[in-house]
Interface confidence: medium
């Protein structure tokens, strides 16, 4: 699986999850988030050669088409597969609020 | 929606579905498919600016991060959203077989 366990331990050029730290205030302008100050959102990148973690029959077809037509712009793309939520703390006036934001952290990638 | 109705009628530079005809024999080497000879598989391509058909909170976050850090390699990617099956005819010996291959035709795209 193209997950953090594999990708963070290997120098993988092809589609894999990569570490990316995002500071809420500096990188997003989300000044309301009190904690955490930032988090590892991660991202997916890298080429998708034929059959690499193909998501659908279409991505398999496109990967094969691309090997035979390497100059073509049509090729599968490395995108998130499994995502996890992130719990944030913010304040409404002086009242602390805890909220879970869904699909915030990429745990694995696929070729789609 | 970034679907064939919209994308095939407009000169859209950003993420959209694009027409792509694939000949089973010439482009994939699939000699076993008798009918059709080929089909419009289509594909997704184009930049994913902030909030363009964002698939998840993560793709929204990544798009926003990318507006402030345009040089960063971390950005959402234009990939298939809705796919449709394709019915094919092939032979096992002299016996014709009809099969529906799932997720073969891209009908719309998203930024993921």
């Amino acid at each position: 699986a193209l997950d953090t366990n594999y990708c963070f331990r290997n120098l993988e050029e092809n589609c894999c999850v990569r570490p990316l730290y995002i500071d809420f205030r500096q990188d997003l302008g989300w000044k309301w988030v009190h904690e955490p100050k930032g988090y590892y959102a991660n991202f997916c990148s890298g080429p998708c050669p034929y059959l690499r973690s193909a998501d659908t029959t279409h991505s398999t077809v496109l990967g094969l088409y691309n090997t035979l037509n390497p100059e073509a712009s049509a090729s599968p793309c490395c995108v998130p597969q499994d995502l996890e939520p992130l719990t944030i703390l913010y304040y409404v006036g002086r009242t602390p609020k805890v909220e879970q934001l869904s699909n915030m952290v990429v745990k694995s990638c696929k070729c789609s | 929606a970034l679907d064939t109705n919209y994308c095939f009628r407009n000169l859209e530079e950003n993420c959209c579905v694009r027409p792509l005809y694939i000949d089973f024999r010439q482009d994939l080497g699939w000699k076993w498919v008798h009918e059709p000879k080929g089909y419009y598989a289509n594909f997704c391509s184009g930049p994913c600016p902030y909030l363009r058909s964002a698939d998840t909170t993560h793709s929204t976050v990544l798009g926003l991060y990318n507006t402030l850090n345009p040089e960063a390699s971390a950005s959402p990617c234009c990939v298939p959203q809705d796919l449709e099956p394709l019915t094919i005819l092939y032979y096992v010996g002299r016996t014709p077989k009809v099969e529906q291959l799932s997720n073969m035709v891209v009908k719309s795209c998203k930024c993921s």
Partner: antibody, heavy 121, light 110 residues
Amino acid sequence: QSLEESGGRLVTPGTPLTLTCTASGFSLSSYDMSWVRQAPGKGLEWIGIIYGGSGSTWYASWAKGRFTMSKTSTTVDLKITSPTTEDMATYFCARGRDGGAGGSRNGYSLWGQGTLVTVSS
Amino acid sequence: AYDMTQTPASVEVAVGGTVTIKCQASESIYSGLAWYQQTPGQRPKLLIYAASDLASGVPSRFKGSGSGTEYTLTISGVECADAATYYCQQTWTDGGIDNPFGGGTEVVVK
């Protein structure tokens, strides 16, 4: 504590113009500072913000490339890079309600009186 | 992104009456909302922050409420001095936005 804008005047289209917001009674390094404009008879239009401490800036999507914000210890500048007639408005600077990181999350409690920019050939 | 839609554009109210102004965000702003009052030729004045907290020196007849994407400013016991234009502003984020302010509501006091 007060804010005063200056630099507004009549300019010809395409002539760069810099507006200055001067703060009194507090340190700009501790507060988020924004520029907001208002065309005659129209609503409030946010241009951007410069954060206290880090000095990092955010601009409205329509304002990127058209405006540049910078600051010193006592002033915040807004440069209109190439004014058009669409930029004719009163320009206000505004301070976040609270000091420290994210202090503008509770709105802008201190505003200048505004400075008028007229663009005409 | 985080577009603010304010309604109505204009409202007429009698002295002593109650007026309600609504503000809708295109996505959740987690109570990150401020309200301002502006009279002609004057600078805006902060009335309410964090959706419901009254700014310093603001009379208690001004009340803010709401959460998520829907917010309301209510002025009860309206006085002549309340004739002004009122604006909402999302304060959740500065990133990737067009304008954090709503279009404004003109309150006319009869």
